[in-house]
């Protein structure tokens, strides 16, 4: 007996071939001997089976002695043995229909779990193997679960169902809802405008939800909400914003925030959360602000940074085109009695400059000028 695997919702074509290459009488029946379809001369006739409106054939092949049974919009319950009667002989085909579905929405938040459920006909014993977009293989029986979804799990999952040495392949598109970056850091000189961007790692036609940016300033004892906003069909509208600082927010995606001035009291880290409509849980992105200030007070040239810096970052003061006068893994450095000229304050990581501020030291009789 020939075995054919089909997919729920798909179309399957069961073949039946006569030795004579011409149109002759044929009938397709199910295991209960109920006629599905056949022919009367060159006319297609249909029987009383429940497949009636979903069964068809190809008249174009009859003249070549081929009498296919086409079943459209397959259902699991179409799994059966189908019998083709032609030329006083019977051809039997066993059809097994499988379905594979994500038992939740296919749009899942980062960190959530994905469960794939296999629908199969009674008496079958299929095995399933799925390959994620990043090449990770998972195996299972009727259900397969993947916990802690990551951004790289977004894309097409290819699942192969094996039964009777035959296989059928399913493709399921999974979208992991997340920000492109889990964390970002912005380095700014005091007084500069600060731009925070929160690009999403997915695109959907309609995006609705609400969000908030909580900020923990380095100098503050507790965090505070800087801004709350709504998102409706990818349009952003601000609900509430603090007076200090007075953030501005872009009206379109990607989410974009502007801080008019980088000041030491704003240095710190924030957490932007986005709650999407019809989703449990929230998307998170951490954002950090490091602010640098270079000053000269009387005979003391000082460079300071505020905000979350790693211990391996180096803070240096140097006269232009000369060796660093002072270099420390600290958040403040200074030079006493600095000689006149253009001084540079540098924050660097393994030789790569992250932030620099220049200050001009004038001869002792005049006041310093900050460019």
């Amino acid at each position: 007996k020939k075995v054919v695997l089909g997919k729920k919702g798909d179309t399957v074509e069961l073949t039946c071939t006569a030795s004579q290459k011409k149109s002759i009488q044929f009938h397709w029946k199910n295991s209960n001997q109920i006629k599905i379809l056949g022919n009367q001369g060159s006319f297609l006739t249909k029987g009383p089976s429940k497949l009636n409106d979903r069964a068809d054939s190809r008249r174009s092949l009859w003249d070549q002695g081929n009498f296919p049974l086409i079943i459209k919009n397959l259902k699991i319950e179409d799994s059966d043995t189908y019998i083709c009667e032609v030329e006083d002989q019977k051809e039997e085909v066993q059809l097994l229909v499988f379905g594979l579905t994500a038992n939740s929405d296919t749009h899942l938040l980062q960190g959530q779990s994905l469960t794939l459920t296999l629908e199969s006909p009674p008496g079958s014993s299929p095995s399933v193997q799925c390959r994620s977009p990043r090449g990770k293989n998972i195996q299972g029986g009727k259900t397969l679960s993947v916990s802690q979804l990551e951004l790289q799990d977004s894309g097409t999952w290819t699942c192969t169902v094996l039964q009777n040495q035959k296989k059928v392949e399913f493709k399921i598109d999974i979208v992991v809802l997340a920000f492109q970056k889990a964390s970002s850091i912005v380095y700014k000189k005091e007084g500069e405008q600060v731009e925070f961007s929160f690009p999403l790692a997915f695109t959907v036609e309609k995006l609705t939800g609400s969000g908030e940016l909580w900020w923990q300033a380095e100098r503050a004892s507790s965090s505070k909400s800087w801004i709350t906003f709504d998102l409706k069909n990818k349009e952003v509208s601000v609900k509430r914003v603090t007076q200090d600082p007075k953030l501005q927010m872009g009206k379109k995606l990607p989410l974009h925030l502007t801080l008019p001035q980088a000041l030491p009291q704003y240095a710190g880290s924030g957490n932007l959360t986005l709650a999407l409509e019809a989703k449990t849980g929230k998307l998170h992105q951490e954002v950090n602000l490091v602010v640098m200030r270079a000053t000269q007070l009387q005979k003391n040239l000082t460079c300071e940074v505020w905000g979350p810096t790693s211990p391996k970052l180096m803070l240096s003061l140097k006269l232009e085109n000369k060796e660093a006068k002072v270099s420390k893994r600290e958040k403040a450095v200074w030079v006493l009695n600095p000689e006149a000229g253009m001084w540079q304050c540098l924050l660097s990581d393994s030789g790569q400059v992250l932030l620099e501020s220049n200050i001009k030291v004038l001869p002792t009789w005049s006041t310093p000028v900050q460019p």
Epitope: G6, D10, E13, S42, L44, D56, S57, R58, R59, S60
Partner: antibody, heavy 118, light 107 residues
Framework: EVQLVESGGGLVKPGGSLRLSCAAS????????MHWVRQAPGKGLEWVSA????????YYADSVKGRFTISRDDSKNTLYLQMNSLKTEDTAVYYC???????????WGRGTLVTVSS | DIQMTQSPSSLSASVGDRVTITCRAS??????LAWYQQKPGKAPKLLIY???TLESGVPSRFSGSGSGTDFTLTISSLQPEDFATYYC?????????FGGGTKVEIK
């Protein structure tokens, strides 16, 4: 998105060869028969070739039999038409079309223009 | 080969008119027939299959009838977007064949 996108058309001299491709997406390509249909400039539609879902059987119009070969690669969701010994009368927009079963075309590509001229 | 003959080859009509296009097969083809609509520079679009079954998403003003050798496509009330060329196609035997087309123009 359910779609078919043809490519590979262009200008070729009589007697030359060309291979057309049709990339399918958004549906179960392997379970559908596929067809090529052409349309000469300012003229009607002409069926060219068909291939069964499993790729075992193919069918051709008399005008292209022996010169054209239809094939499919289900792993790439792609349909092909290898056109050899091209004639000026093969000049047309070539469409790939999905078979609704039986032999009705419910999804078409935008077409690719093949010009056979010396 | 089965020849499909459409008539008329072109017609002029106004919005709101009832339009009938006929298709004749050179031999009996039972109900193995489809109708397509094609607009300039676009791919054809399936309207009706199995002679009278309306494809999903196609407006109900389109209808098909006939069996054997004579078939009809009717547009009950012509709309501006219906001005196009219409083709019939038989699925009775290979080679599959199309009618020559009927161009529906604005009067």
């Amino acid at each position: 998105e359910v779609q078919l996108v043809e490519s590979g058309g262009g200008l070729v001299k009589p007697g030359g060869s060309l291979r057309l491709s049709c990339a399918a997406s958004g549906f179960a390509f392997s379970s559908h028969w596929m067809h090529w249909v052409r349309q000469a400039p300012g003229k009607g539609l002409e069926w060219v070739s068909a291939i069964s879902g499993n790729g075992d059987n193919s069918y051709y119009a008399d005008s292209v039999k022996g010169r054209f070969t239809i094939s499919r690669d289900d792993s790439k969701n792609t349909l092909y038409l290898q056109m050899n010994s091209l004639k000026t009368e093969d000049t047309a927009v070539y469409y790939c079309a999905r078979d609704r079963a039986p032999e009705y075309f419910d999804l078409w590509g935008r077409g690719t223009l093949v010009t056979v001229s010396s | 080969d089965i020849q499909m003959t459409q008539s008329p080859s072109s017609l002029s009509a106004s919005v709101g008119d009832r339009v009938t296009i006929t298709c004749r097969a050179s031999q009996g083809i039972d109900s193995w027939l489809a109708w397509y609509q094609q607009k300039p520079g676009k791919a054809p679009k399936l309207l009706i299959y199995a002679a009278s079954t309306l494809e999903s998403g196609v407006p109900s003003r389109f209808s098909g009838s006939g069996s054997g050798t004579d078939f009809t496509l009717t547009i009950s009330s012509l709309q501006p977007e219906d001005f196009a060329t219409y083709y019939c196609q038989q699925a009775y035997s290979f080679p599959l064949t199309f009618g020559g087309g009927t161009k529906v123009e604005i009067k």
